[in-house]
């Protein structure tokens, strides 16, 4: 069962921090780890390793802990004030503008460009024209125009939300 | 005596809008969190939203998700749905309700939904 | 989300009998989290038990609530004529939060 908090355990200075969602402390506010009950009265342990919260709060319900997904590497367990961290794997990243899913990261730069930044989780190689130095825009490219090997396909999709 | 008293139901064209009331007496209002539930005809009890007793946490059911928006008035002790771009399958009576999670320990008498062309 | 199966579908007893309502989880609720309504035609639901097993206020003490995990029982020991109506379970562990589809008590 989860730990209960009284508004009166809680530190006056805790009562009425953040004071952003609210028109007073005495409609209460939760610290992180916790959630509100439904009648005001407690503040309620969010479940180690199931759901978390990380600011204050007046949640009826702590978060879902992310699960990672496979084509990913947890760089640090959820917790009870925090998510999971998940991370994709070697040689795949995660773009900003396609976040659920990693992609395999090329193997190499079209004709006449040279790599000038590895594969990362976050980004892909980075390939600058030889002679202008100007950045590949980031598509990849056909085989026939790869220095190296062909290009990887779309990993499988990696979620981000619990 | 705990008293939950809903209103602003009514017939609406599909892709219409409609606000539902439920005025609240007899508890500390903005101590309780508050749902709405609904009930199609013929039908069993389907939640809608729910929402915080300060209003800083909002809950929806899929189904309503970007459409029903849950809000309410502390000092005016009372609790709203905005129902926009309303749909046949959204037709049903809707019951004001106190509690979010462990019970619904009070209930309105329901206000009537119809969404009819 | 939490899809709870209520079981039977409709219940055909006679005053005095006992009724007994199953409701089951599709992933384990918390007994906190787990109540019964009652319904009857052209009214609002009334909340019976709450936790699982503790009656409501006003509730008679015929009405008994009982389980853990993903199953969970409501128990009528003898019908009274009031009694015959629909009964839901509710689970409020994880949004959104559900009710079962209802279990209809009638006179045989």
């Known amino acids: 069962e989860s730990a209960l908090i009284t508004q009166q355990d809680l530190a006056p200075q805790q009562r009425a921090a953040p004071q952003q969602k609210r028109s007073s402390p005495s409609e209460g506010l939760c610290p992180p780890g916790h959630h509100i009950s439904e009648d005001g009265r407690d503040c309620i342990s969010c479940k180690y390793g199931q759901d978390y919260s990380t600011h204050w709060n007046d949640l009826l319900f702590c978060l879902r802990c992310t699960r990672c997904d496979s084509g990913e590497v947890e760089l640090s367990p959820c917790t009870t004030t925090r998510n999971t961290v998940c991370q994709c794997e070697e040689g795949t990243f995660r773009e900003e503008d396609s976040p659920e899913m990693c992609r395999k990261c090329r193997t190499g730069c079209p004709r006449g460009m040279v790599k000038v930044g590895d594969c990362t989780p976050w980004s892909d190689i980075e390939c600058v024209h030889k002679e202008s130095g100007t950045k590949h825009s980031g598509e990849v490219p056909a085989v026939e125009e790869t220095v190296t090997s062909s290009p990887g396909t779309p990993a499988s999709p990696c979620s981000l939300s619990g | 005596e705990v008293q939950l008293l809903e209103s602003g139901g009514g017939l609406v064209q599909p892709g219409g809008s409609l606000r539902l009331s439920c005025a609240a007496s007899?508890?500390?209002?903005?101590?309780?969190?508050m749902s709405w539930v609904r009930q199609a005809p013929g039908k069993g009890l389907e939640w809608v939203s729910a929402?915080?007793?300060?209003?800083?946490?909002?809950y929806y059911a899929d189904s309503v998700k970007g459409r029903f928006t849950i809000s309410r008035d502390n000092s005016k002790n009372t609790l709203y749905l905005q129902m926009n771009s309303l749909r046949a399958e959204d037709a049903a009576v809707y019951y004001c309700?106190?509690?979010?999670?462990?019970?619904?320990?009070?209930w309105g008498q329901g206000t009537l939904v119809t969404v009819s062309s | 989300e939490i899809v709870l199966t209520q079981s039977p579908g409709t219940l055909s007893l006679s005053p005095g009998e006992r009724a007994t309502l199953s409701c089951r989880a599709s992933q384990s609720v918390s007994s906190s989290y787990l109540a019964w309504y009652q319904q009857k035609p052209g009214q609002a639901p009334r909340l019976l038990i709450y936790?699982?097993?503790s009656r409501a206020t006003g509730i008679p003490d015929r009405f008994s609530g009982s389980g853990s995990g993903t199953d969970f029982t409501l128990t009528i020991s003898r019908l009274e004529p009031e009694d015959f109506a629909v009964y839901y379970c509710?689970?409020?562990?994880?949004?959104?939060?559900?009710f079962g589809q209802g279990t209809k008590v009638e006179i045989k």
């Open positions: 007899g508890f500390t209002f903005s101590s309780y969190a």
């Open positions: 929402i915080s007793g300060s209003g800083g946490s909002t």
């Open positions: 309700a106190k509690g979010v999670r462990k019970k619904f320990d009070y």
């Open positions: 509710q689970q409020g562990q994880l949004p959104p939060i559900t």
């Open positions: 936790g699982a097993s």
